[in-house]
């Protein structure tokens, strides 16, 4: 279907700006992989670029608002012509669910204490209210609980005093309209305009005071101006030239108020003074290339030697990554495609380990599945040796970090039968459904 | 001049595959998408799908993913239409159309057709 | 998929007179940000490529004559030849580009009495 064309995609908020135009399709918006599109306004906006992950939402409330519940976050894969990593259609959400606890303890409610004496009526003539109160005491309420009903009550009192009124003006009326709307008529043009004395009207019984003043007042009509001249248009304008060598663009028509000019105040000309269209080079836009995240790290070799593992003698390895993406003669990928480092291999090698204290709670998982559950473990974790942070492998070019590298074989005592992983599992509560906040908003 | 010129007939087995080309002339061939649309005798229009030159993005109908691909050389020029595995029903005419785009406005209609490739297939 | 249905499957007019063709589609083809019909018309005459006519629904493709003229929106659409010419017995085809697939009439034969 054709859609709403963006020439900018916000990755913050996932929103689309700047809007071209509607009724272009994908295609030719996305000649621009800059820009972005919506297939209905106020729908989902989908960048132009090769498709990956947004960012994470921020977490939804939490499912209960006191004791342990649950809360959802997701991430879309956005973009246009590909998939995500795991395979993944644009559009499609991945879910995070956690525990979470806005208040540890649930609210309890109070009671009553008896009702107080009432108090004295508002007024000292005509009618009023009087109040009378009670405390939420009896017992008090826990947790940020509160007594049902209100805590203090009102009724109707008579002083059976008649209260005098006095007299106030209402607003003044409009100016009656002056009897010549352009100057160098035969009269001089007046306007009056008057007022009541009805806000409100004074008593009879007891006897208000009059309303202060005069009910009406005259003026001269000064200033009025020459008869006015309505505006016309002229003719639309030639079209400009496409503004850009790739894309879309908005080419624009202008027109001048000016057939004839508004004289005297006359109304300007009603409509537009230009009108945009979009307009189409059908040439792409050139793509830069994007560094793929780094591969792994090679094993930790010293060249001539067999094996260096479990030994304090340094290594080199090194990683790679692939410049993706690039077409249309955009610009390479800056920076370096391999990564070489110095490091000890302790690859396999026993070492004394110890328990670590517990991890944070972990993500409650499947999130969208049936029964979800969340763990935390304590690890048998190594003690490094105490190798010698840098070392200095050629004359004259300093020290250099060396890093360990490898997963080295931790020795810790027994705990809880396990002798690397002890892990402790519990289910999530009040876990929410999965849904789409862009169905939702439909 | 547009113009739009069309390989010539083919004669195929059923379960063979046919190759038709679609070469441009008289316009940036890059600027203008090049769809392909199947006529059986007698019979009316059915659109297959469009390939950009430029950018070498498809788009097919459903109905003839898998048994349609579309390719394109800039250097020549020319389009490509290549059907797969086929049956009586891929008798027709088939037709290149060029998508239509004046004055940098944008339009999707067809303004220039090939004179059709036609296909027969029999055993 | 859109189904673009037309009416009348054939029609016979006199030389001189106005023959009328009309095009339903299963769905609007107005977009409503830019209040276009994405509808064209296409000739076609036995032997020969169609050639396109009317694009927007409405707009003549250059080099048309003005005795062509399209009408309609959304979902109704009119194609009108003010006084038929000999020349113009054809086949004539609605297509819509809203949505992929395209989609077009199955046509309407265009004879003279």
């Known amino acids: 279907d054709p859609v709403l064309c963006f020439t900018q995609y916000e990755e913050s908020s996932g929103k689309c700006k700047g809007l071209l135009g509607g009724g272009v399709s994908v295609e030719d918006c996305c000649l621009n992989t800059a820009f972005a599109y919506q297939k209905r306004s106020g729908g989902l906006c989908q960048p132009c670029r090769s498709p990956r992950w947004s960012l994470w939402s921020t977490w939804a409330p939490c499912s209960v608002t006191c004791s342990e519940g649950s809360q959802l976050r997701y991430r879309r894969c956005v973009g246009w012509n590909g998939q995500c990593s795991g395979k993944v259609a644009p559009g499609t959400l991945e879910w995070q669910l956690q525990a979470c606890e806005d208040q540890q303890c649930c609210p309890e409610m109070g009671g009553w204490s008896g009702w107080g004496p009432w108090e004295p009526c508002s007024v000292t003539c005509s009618k009023g209210t009087r109040t009378r109160r009670r405390a939420c005491n009896h017992p008090a309420p826990k947790c940020g609980g509160h007594c049902p009903g209100q805590a203090q009550e009102s009724e109707a009192c008579d002083t059976q005093q008649v209260c005098p009124t006095h007299g106030a003006w209402a607003t003044w009326g409009p100016w009656t309209p002056c009897s010549a709307s352009c100057h160098g008529g035969p009269h001089e043009p007046k306007e009056t305009r008057s007022r009541k004395c009805s806000a409100p009207e004074p008593s009879q019984k007891p006897p208000g005071k009059p309303c202060p003043g005069l009910a009406y007042e005259q003026r001269r009509c000064t200033g009025l101006p020459p008869c006015p001249v309505a505006g016309g248009w002229g003719p639309w304008g030639p079209v400009s030239p496409c503004p850009v060598t790739c894309g879309l663009g908005q080419t624009m028509e202008q027109r001048t108020c000016n057939h004839p000019v508004p004289q005297h105040g006359g109304p300007f000309c009603a409509g537009d003074a230009t009108r945009t269209h979009i307009c189409n080079t059908a040439v792409p836009c050139p793509v830069d290339g994007e560094w793929d995240s780094w591969g792994e790290w090679s094993p930790c070799i010293r060249r001539n030697m067999k094996s260096i593992s479990c030994q304090e003698i340094p290594g080199q390895q090194s990683r790679g990554r692939t410049c993706r993406g690039r077409k249309f003669d955009g610009h390479r990928c800056a920076g370096q495609q391999q990564d070489i480092r110095h490091c000890y291999s302790i690859q396999h090698c026993p070492l004394k380990g110890s328990w670590s204290e517990w991890s944070t709670w972990g993500l409650c998982m499947p999130p969208c599945g049936p029964n979800p559950t969340r763990a935390r473990q304590r690890l048998c974790t190594p003690l490094l040796p105490k190798y010698p942070p840098t070392v200095s492998m050629v004359e004259g070019q300093g020290e250099k970090n060396v890093t360990f590298w490898g997963r080295p074989l931790p020795r810790c005592e027994e705990l809880q039968g396990q002798k690397l992983v002890v892990e402790e599992k519990r289910p999530c509560l009040h876990v929410p459904a999965c849904k789409d906040p862009e169905e939702e908003e439909l | 001049e547009v113009q739009l010129q069309q390989s010539g007939p083919e004669l195929v087995k059923p379960g063979a595959s046919v190759k038709m080309s679609c070469k441009a002339s008289g316009y940036t061939f890059a600027h203008n998408w090049i769809h392909w649309v199947k006529q059986k005798p007698g019979q009316g229009l059915e659109w297959i799908g469009y390939i950009n030159p430029g950018t070498d993005y498809t788009e097919y109908s459903q109905r003839f993913k898998g048994k349609a691909t579309l390719t394109s050389d800039k250097s020549s020029s020319t389009a490509y239409m290549e059907l797969s595995s086929l049956t009586s029903e891929d008798s027709a005419v088939y037709y290149c159309?060029?998508?239509?785009?004046?004055?940098?406005?944008?339009?999707?209609?067809?303004?220039?057709w090939g004179q059709g490739t036609l296909v027969t297939v029999s055993a | 998929d859109i189904v673009m249905t037309q009416s009348p499957d054939s029609l016979a007019v006199s030389l001189g007179e106005r023959a009328t063709i009309n095009c339903k589609s299963s769905q609007s083809l107005l977009y409503s940000s830019n209040q276009k019909n994405y509808l064209a018309w296409y000739q076609q005459k036995p032997g020969q490529p169609p050639k396109l006519l009317i694009y927007?629904?409405?707009t003549r493709e250059s080099g048309v004559p003005d005795r062509f003229s399209g009408s309609g929106s959304g979902t109704d659409f009119t194609l009108t030849i003010s006084s038929l010419q000999a020349e113009d017995v054809a086949v004539y085809y609605c297509?819509?580009?809203?949505?992929?697939?395209?989609?077009f009439g199955g046509g309407t034969k265009l004879e003279i009495k």
């Open positions: 297509q819509q580009y809203y949505s992929y697939p395209y989609t």
């Open positions: 159309a060029r998508r239509k785009l004046y004055g940098n406005f944008v339009d999707y209609a067809m303004d220039y």
């Open positions: 927007w629904a409405s």
